[in-house]
Amino acid sequence: SDAYLNASETTTLSPSGSAVISTTTIATTPSKPTCDEKYANITVDYLYNKETKLFTAKLNVNENVECGNNTCTNNEVHNLTECKNASVSISHNSCTAPDKTLILDVPPGVEKFQLHDCTQVEKADTTICLKWKNIETFTCDTQNITYRFQCGNMIFDNKEIKLENLEPEHEYKCDSEILYNNHKFTNASKIIKTDFGSPGEPQIIFCRSEAAHQGVITWNPPQRSFHNFTLCYIKETEKDCLNLDKNLIKYDLQNLKPYTKYVLSLHAYIIAKVQRNGSAAMCHFTTKSAPPSQVWNMTVSMTSDNSMHVKCRPPRDRNGPHERYHLEVEAGNTLVRNESHKNCDFRVKDLQYSTDYTFKAYFHNGDYPGEPFILHHSTSYNSKAHHHHHHHH
């Protein structure tokens, strides 16, 4: 079939002198290439049979070749054991000896590799990690194994890839293949949807207190998906947190301490592969004043027959901006003294002798007076006058 006709013309003179043109046709066959030359760059694909755990080598040639001792059907060499070399002698009638000796370097079994999602759950909202794992041993030279990933427009030549700084709640597709001596023998694809991201920050509209024991906060929710809110309010070192329904946009805080600065923090969260908290929005207010609590541990002691020393301890709750102690001294229903000090320490002199007095001590915070602490105490008779009279007799 590769032979071709080569026609040559010759001219001779006959005895009569007339020219006779005779044409001779010679069949020639050009020299065939050697099979070694013809199939020098032959490529092979390996197909794996999961049942038999054997490979088939598919020879990438245009014509049906013969394989010497190894039988090959439709250019396929069957029943090849993983990690074993097989020698195939390739010939065809279009080429001459020597045959092409093809060494089939059979790859490891496909099921010995597993494409594993190695993404840490904490980072799964913006990160993908994929890794080929060797889940069984094999005898092939691992140096001859190469890995390739293609994720969108990105190509990696690694056994493991990590993609950070992705978008949350987004599908990404990665195709991967493993090559043995540059022959692909397995591939896998994964579509990974990144996890829900941290919700955004709520936008606080207002945050204020218009009473001594109450406060109010209103807000707009964040744009991204979330499940609920956490509202924390901190006074000094005490912190209380509440879980609030996702549909709320206002919360009334009750049972607050008067004249106290409260720092509020509000964040949305989502429970995904892990709980992700959004950034917290912060605000603060100071509750209004209220009457202070009662002074305590009040004592009235005599310093002389008609002098008293009144002391008390500060109220537990001042509930206002200022600090002032008041003492009212009554005899009967008549107010006889009204004093105000920075400290609860009053020296009351020149009272009537032998008189019952009512001492009322209370705290005033600049806005409100507290409940008075009331004690009754009597002055003594004038001991000096009595003594002088006795001496006179």
Epitope: N153, E164, N165
Partner: nanobody, 128 residues
Framework: QVQLQESGGGLVRPGGSLRLSCAAS????????MGWFRQAPGKEREFVAA????????YYADSVKGRFTISRDNAKNTAYLQMNSLKPEDTAVYYC?????????????????????WGQGTLVTVSS
Amino acid sequence: QVQLQESGGGLVRPGGSLRLSCAASGGTFSSYAMGWFRQAPGKEREFVAAIGGSGDSTYYADSVKGRFTISRDNAKNTAYLQMNSLKPEDTAVYYCQADPTMFHKLYYGIHPNEYEYWGQGTLVTVSS
């Protein structure tokens, strides 16, 4: 708002090395992927290398694979590009870039114009 300032460019012979630095200020540095792009005279700006916010993931253009290494020091708010075995075709202005979703943009092959924050650039000339 992130500000970026490149340094380390200069003239180098073929086969030589250079290390570019990119200092960042403003924003939380570790939440941004950092990238290097370059623009040769008369050509479009092209991607060179990228590194994720934690430094765990890196990605390179085929033309620089095996020669260039991108790294970052989050404590110093700085990204680096170590360039070895430099070739005349590496001559360009090198730009540092910060983007919170850079690998998303690389996945989709989004044009560099769509990326967020850019430095002013530093010139690298490879010539004998």
